[in-house]
Amino acid sequence: KSSNEATNITPKHNMKAFLDELKAENIKKFLYNFTQIPHLAGTEQNFQLAKQIQSQWKEFGLDSVELAHYDVLLSYPNKTHPNYISIINEDGNEIFNTSLFEPPPPGYENVSDIVPPFSAFSPQGMPEGDLVYVNYARTEDFFKLERDMKINCSGKIVIARYGKVFRGNKVKNAQLAGAKGVILYSDPADYFAPGVKSYPDGWNLPGGGVQRGNILNLNGAGDPLTPGYPANEYAYRRGIAEAVGLPSIPVHPIGYYDAQKLLEKMGGSAPPDSSWRGSLKVPYNVGPGFTGNFSTQKVKMHIHSTNEVTRIYNVIGTLRGAVEPDRYVILGGHRDSWVFGGIDPQSGAAVVHEIVRSFGTLKKEGWRPRRTILFASWDAEEFGLLGSTEWAEENSRLLQERGVAYINADSSIEGNYTLRVDCTPLMYSLVHNLTKELKSPDEGFEGKSLYESWTKKSPSPEFSGMPRISKLGSGNDFEVFFQRLGIASGRARYTKNWETNKFSGYPLYHSVYETYELVEKFYDPMFKYHLTVAQVRGGMVFELANSIVLPFDCRDYAVVLRKYADKIYSISMKHPQEMKTYSVSFDSLFSAVKNFTEIASKFSERLQDFDKSNPIVLRMMNDQLMFLERAFIDPLGLPDRPFYRHVIYAPSSHNKYAGESFPGIYDALFDIESKVDPSKAWGEVKRQIYVAAFTVQAAAETLSEVA
């Protein structure tokens, strides 16, 4: 099981001692402490919190705790010139204005520095024009509008409801459709669960609540002005015109009270089907423009936000490994919040804090992990994963040589129904084995394992009797580690029942109402779900840092590679004639997957049989496991997305939050029937099959006997 080097605690008690030390009441106390004032990235308050965490991690017993600062592009509203949207009449008079701030929650009326709702990195502008309702502004929504309904968004202001996909993808789609502005709003259909009261009486979004968020399309670049390199003291910065991922049209978010005022007047085309209707008492007409009586009225946006290079601070704590100090297991989560961060991120940061405290307690008793554990409190995640990405860029050479695993620790909860895990297939067995050893916190599962309740409530769609484990996408700080550097990564949190609650995320996400009281009153009064998440995240880190043989199973990669190859082949076979015409063959990919399966199984056999007392052979086998994820990295990256380099997984081009398998082939096939040059398009499909097949085969060979 676990190593016993440099410790006075018996091996079988190591993990138990660590888990037993985790306390729900501590997590509760830390959450309260982290949520009393806003901690917006780039502000003095967040710098002070960084120093507090640094100090406390030192007290907890870490070997060293340092601040790592970077000067990155951030975005803020203009304090004297607020952002808003108005309806104007034919004379240009503003007859309706959206609210300038969210009504503060009870007890927080006198808190200063609450940033008003805004879309971070929106350019300045005051466009006016007719409104077009574009549903969720997904790729398929614009296809429906442009191709089926023949509605042209060019020169229009579009209004889109939040949900389903990352907001940056919505803005990108609107830009491509020719829109000159975007209004984002939260529809009760997506952010108001039936039968639950709105905050402060329940966990639903009130009509004045608004979701903040960045609208970048960074594709893994980090700081928009220093892609690929750290934003340090001597950085060369691009001009703003060359910055990566910035939107080109003004964008602003509103709540559903204000959205009602805009949508109730909509005219033009009726919604194409019921999937375009939300829950407001409006017709959900698509437009363009307002109906008869109001047809001369227009919508005008007033956006005055500014982009500013600002200093951010990561906190990096180190617990040196006793046996393999040059092998790093990283636990990281962000610290910056939009306002109070009751869930995002502080429910995660509080859990990390307690995990650090528990590890520190063991260290003070004479124990050390086998491998080095790095703890990170990232800054500016909300502005595009900037803190984690800049740090990884600065330390990329160390990380690619020494990085064993990265465990993410953002929000611990997005519900209180069951566990949710996204991770590399290498960690499937680790997660299964760990959750079988942990107690379920769920009602009705007393005395049962977490694995049991998780499997019952969230069964795998493909493999019966197993829990669902999802692909890693993006939208969080694991991105640079997994998608760019190829370090095995995973994340875990407690989630809602997706079957019965079809709203997107949790209703109060990124609003002023995401408070300590939201968690303590409505989500997890006993903090038992937080504790369970601490046990899962901490347990994973413990095993990854302490087990003699790394707890990675390459056979599970073989299983998913077969599944993904089958899936992408099936997509391609929707075009049998073109497959024939352009001689498109998947034989090379299927052959590579079979070879991977064969070699992975032989490696697993050797892993069971080798002499674990031989440190050289042990290190050699562990290195093959550690570097397997790295072997799926293509140094050239994906087409037009150089920082997404993992050939098996990438964030979906249509939704940053979602993971796509064989993304190069998938994107080459996407909407291929509409391409103007089919020969070129199918040539790209063939090239992507070649890249995928080569990469899988090359990865397989890293598992072969070394000589």
Partner: antibody
């Protein structure tokens, strides 16, 4: 030498249950996908179910989905097939088969001798 | 009804050559590897051909396999009376996520 020995077959009434076992030896059991394949009297081979190496991802033929459950215990080198809601058409010799390639089913290089399951009232 | 189609029976005299066809679709034979099994009367099946055309050790070179498009073929030359058996083709089906077999072909050596 690779050996697969099935047991647990017998006569059962329609709607009843039966659990088949397959004891494996002579290879690293956990590294290979294992399958159950059946053959009704006088008929051809029909693949029933498979379980991967690693965490044990499962696959089923449509004809048995929701009624049969495949499982394995790598520490005991044993494969199981739990058969519930049995029907007359499930009557067959059930073979345990080892995959030749690895963690997912490709082709079977070793087969057991089979165990007969008869579903009849 | 089997996903893969084989002729129910074939026959030939000793010393002759015989071929058994196996027809499928793009989602099975079209993209995946084909294997062939021999089942002598009263015994368990035995692997005869794998990866379309490879023979496990101990299988004589009288047995051969080939694949073209969505069809596969098993060839047996120099027929012997001991070759009388049922022969099955098998492969993975990428759409069904399942192993599929042909209905079997009974070989009679006259």
């Amino acid at each position: 030498e690779v050996q697969l020995v099935e047991s647990g077959g017998g006569l059962v009434q329609p709607g009843g249950s039966l659990r088949l076992s397959c004891a494996a030896s002579g290879f690293t059991f956990s590294s290979y996908a294992m399958s159950w394949v059946r053959q009704a009297p006088g008929k051809g081979l029909e693949w029933v179910s498979a379980i991967s190496g690693g965490i044990g991802s499962t696959y089923y033929a449509d004809s048995v989905k929701g009624r049969f459950t495949i499982s394995r215990d790598n520490s005991k080198n044993t494969l199981w097939l739990q058969m519930n809601s049995l029907r007359a058409e499930d009557t067959a010799v059930y073979y345990c088969a080892k995959d030749a390639v690895g963690a997912t089913p490709y082709y079977f290089d070793y087969w057991g001798q089979g165990t007969l399951v008869t579903v009849s009232s | 009804q089997s996903v893969l189609t084989q002729p129910p029976s074939v026959s030939a005299a000793p010393g002759q050559k015989v071929t058994i066809s196996c027809s499928g679709s793009s989602s099975n034979i079209g993209i995946n590897y084909v294997s062939w099994y021999q089942q002598l009367p009263g015994t368990a099946p035995k692997l005869l051909i794998y990866d379309n055309n490879k023979r496990p050790s101990g299988i004589p070179d009288r047995f051969s396999g080939s694949k073209s498009g969505t069809s596969a073929t098993l060839g047996i030359t120099g027929l012997q009376t001991g070759d009388e058996a049922d022969y099955y083709c098998g492969t993975w089906d990428s759409s069904l996520s399942a192993v599929v077999f042909g209905g079997g072909t009974k070989l009679t050596v006259l």
